[in-house]
Structures are given as structure tokens and as C-alpha cells.
């Protein structure tokens, strides 16, 4: 019969022969010949191969460097990589997360609109008018102004979008 | 067509070094592992030492072969080779070049190896 | 190193005879086990590969089973051209790669 030119899905072309890919998490160590099939063997401790393939070496799991911030959020396995994370208050620095950076804070007069994740910074925006923050955070929302009459007072002193109005009590009238 | 062709058996005295080579043709050499098995006069077979394909191709031994014997390939030539150091009577043997290293699919004719004084 | 110990080292026996050699691993070896047949002055020829698929071209008689430590040939039905060596080759697999052959198996005729 004539050699093939092109093989099925999960195969490979190879001396005019079509092969078995190795499955996932197994590496190539020979061909197929016409007497046996492809020749595969796992990946090693701290390897991987996530396709069907014909590599002669498995790639070795991301290592989640504590020193740049990282931790193993998922452990790899044979046939996917381990996937990193940041610790606590800091957050990835590229889709790769392949190192962190502390979550920014929100200035006085910005709040917390969006919470930092492992993979995404603090997103702040500017207190509207009638709400205001007056620290620098990477959690606080701004906080709206003390309403003085539902206390009974009066504005003394104007809010702003970093400060908190000052309520007084009302002045007397007098006889 | 497919096929291993070894060479470089000779008669030596004990100590003396020799290369054996595995010269492959028929097949992409490398993404193939290759093993080295010997067999001495009326015995059994007994595996010497395997290579990984690819660039790297990580080299294991038999036990009693590591340090004196070396498996290594050169790519662009499509060749095997075994150097074989500090040689002794007990590694007379014939030595086959196969393709593979958990099934042989593929051996070579074999070559002659005589230690001897 | 792994030992892989074949039994027996010589049968004798008649064609159309069922024949069985056993090869057992020192340790685990998963399904990495071959049979080989060897005919005097020739190189070894493969007839089962992973412990138990058959190497194309060799006689459906064939056949081979086991996993882990111990492993089986089986011969269904002897023929002429059987008598030989036969061989197993296990391969542990794992932070190394070590191969090592049985002893080998001589078949005679009886």
C-alpha cells in the first residue's frame, strides 16, 4: 500500500509511517516500528506534559519562589503544571504570576472599589460627594458623611472627600 | 531499510580501551533511545546501558558497567557508540546495539569483543 | 540493580505441547517486560512487549500476561520453529532506568 501523507488525530508522521502520540503526562522515548507501537514513559516526579506529544522530555513544574512571593496554589501533576499564586497582601504581577507585588492602598479621597486578589491589584476610585476616606487602605470603601439630622445637629464644618462633615448642635433662639 | 550496524570488535588485552559503534539508518535516530546489550560466548544477555532520545539524552548503566563503560550518540551522524575502558576477560562478549529500552524492536548483527592475554 | 529470575533454565518438550516460562522482578516493574527469542547465531527477536501485546508479525501462539512482579509466557501450542532461547526483559522505571535480563529458557525437544 501506499505510505501515508497525512495520519489520524492523536497521531504522527514518521518515516512514512503514522504513529501514536503519547498521552498526556508520558513522554516519547522511541517510535513506533512495524513490529510494536509508540514507546512512551511517564513524566518524573516534578514534570509534566499537558498534550498529546511527541517530546523527548517532559517540562518541569514552575517552582513558586516564597522569596518573590509566591505559593503553590495548585499542585501540578503528570499532565498539568503547578500553578502559583501570592502570599497574603500581595498580588501577581503578570498573567504568568511569575513574581508579586504588595496590593496597592487607596489615598485619602480614593476608596476601595475592587478588593486586590492573588492575581489582581486594588482597584481604587474617587469618593463622590457625600462620601469620603480618610486613610490611606487596601480595604476601605468610602464611608458616606455622618448625616447630622438624623442626630439632631447641624453642618459645622463641611465634608470634602477626605474628611467627615462636623456636626454642632443648633443654636438656640433666643427670647 | 531499517537497520543497526555495529562495529569496532577486536581482540585487546586486559586494561586496553575500545569504542564500539552503532551506525543507524532507516529511521529518525533521534527521537529514539538506544540500548547497548552484551552476551557472552554460550551465556545469557545481559544489558550494558541505555540513552534518551533528544539533545540531552540521559545515559543509565548497569551497575557493574558504570565508570568504565560510556554510552553516547552523535546525532548528525546517526551513530552509537560505546567506549569501553579498563577492559577484562569477563566483558568478552558480543555486544548489540538495539533500539528501545523497555521493548528491542530493532538489533543489530552484533560485534565481537575478546579480552584476552 | 533489578534481578529478573526465569524459570526453568531448560524444558524439553513436544510440538503441539502448551508451554509456560515464568520471569519474576526483584521489584515492581509496573508492565515493563519483554520476551525475546533467540536462535542460535542470530541477534534476539521480540515477541511480546508491556508484558502482554503481541510484537507484529510473531504467531498469534504467543501470548504473555503478568503485571508488577511476575510475569508469564505461554507457548499455546508448540511448533518446530519454537525451539530456541527465550529471554525476559524487565526495565524499572522510575527517579533511574535499569533494564535487566532473565536468565534465559531453553526449549528443547523431547
Known amino acids: 500500500p501506499e505510505p501515508p501523507t497525512a495520519c489520524r488525530e492523536k497521531q504522527y508522521l514518521i518515516n512514512s509511517q503514522c504513529c501514536s502520540l503519547c498521552q498526556p503526562g508520558q513522554k516519547l522515548v522511541s517510535d513506533c516500528t512495524e513490529f510494536t507501537e509508540t514507546e512512551c514513559l511517564p513524566c518524573g516526579e516534578s514534570e509534566f506534559l499537558d498534550t498529546w506529544n511527541r517530546e523527548t522530555h517532559c517540562h518541569q513544574h514552575k517552582y513558586c519562589d516564597p522569596n518573590l512571593g509566591l505559593r503553590v496554589q495548585q499542585k501540578g501533576t503528570s499532565e498539568t503544571d503547578t500553578i502559583c499564586t501570592c502570599e497574603e497582601g500581595w498580588h501577581c504581577t503578570s498573567e504568568a504570576c511569575e513574581s508579586c507585588v504588595l496590593h496597592r492602598s487607596c489615598s485619602p479621597g480614593f476608596g476601595v472599589k475592587q478588593i486586590a486578589t492573588g492575581v489582581s491589584d486594588t482597584i481604587c476610585e474617587p469618593c463622590p460627594v457625600g462620601f469620603f476616606s480618610n486613610v490611606s487602605s487596601a480595604f476601605e470603601k468610602c464611608h458616606p458623611w455622618t448625616s447630622c439630622e438624623t442626630k439632631d445637629l447641624v453642618v459645622q464644618q463641611a465634608g470634602t472627600n477626605k474628611t467627615d462633615v462636623v456636626c454642632g448642635p443648633q443654636d438656640r433662639l433666643r427670647a | 531499510e531499517v537497520q543497526l550496524e555495529e562495529s569496532g570488535g577486536d581482540l585487546v588485552q586486559p586494561g586496553a580501551s575500545l569504542r564500539l559503534s552503532c551506525a543507524a539508518s532507516?529511521?529518525?535516530?533521534?527521537?529514539?533511545?538506544m540500548s547497548w546489550v552484551r552476551q557472552a560466548p554460550g551465556k545469557g544477555l545481559e544489558w550494558v546501558a541505555s540513552i534518551y532520545a533528544g539533545g540531552s539524552g540521559s545515559t543509565y548503566y548497569a551497575s557493574w558497567a558504570k565508570g568504565r563503560f560510556t554510552i553516547s550518540k552523535d546525532t548528525s551522524k546517526t551513530t552509537l557508540y560505546l567506549q569501553m575502558n579498563s577492559l577484562r576477560a569477563e566483558d568478552t562478549a558480543t555486544y548489540f546495539c538495539?533500539?528501545?529500552?523497555?521493548?528491542?524492536?530493532?538489533w543489530g548483527q552484533g560485534t565481537l569483543v575478546t579480552v584476552s592475554s | 540493580d533489578i534481578q529478573m529470575t526465569q524459570s526453568p533454565s531448560s524444558l524439553s518438550a513436544s510440538v503441539g505441547d502448551r508451554v509456560t516460562i515464568t520471569c519474576q522482578a526483584s521489584?515492581?516493574?509496573?508492565?515493563?517486560l519483554a520476551w525475546y527469542q533467540q536462535k542460535p547465531g542470530q541477534a534476539p527477536k521480540l515477541l511480546i512487549y508491556d508484558a502482554s501485546k503481541l510484537a507484529s508479525g510473531v504467531p498469534s501462539r504467543f501470548s504473555g500476561s503478568g503485571s508488577g512482579t511476575d510475569f508469564t509466557l505461554t507457548i499455546s501450542s508448540l511448533q518446530p520453529e519454537d525451539f530456541a532461547t527465550y529471554y525476559c526483559?524487565?526495565?524499572?522505571?522510575?527517579?533511574?532506568?535499569?533494564?535487566?535480563f532473565g536468565q534465559g529458557t531453553k526449549v528443547v525437544i523431547k
Open positions: 538495539a533500539r528501545g529500552i523497555t521493548r528491542l524492536p530493532l
Open positions: 526483559q524487565g526495565t524499572y522505571y522510575g527517579s533511574t532506568t535499569i533494564s535487566a
Open positions: 521489584q515492581s516493574i509496573s508492565s515493563y
Open positions: 532507516g529511521f529518525d535516530f533521534n527521537s529514539n533511545a
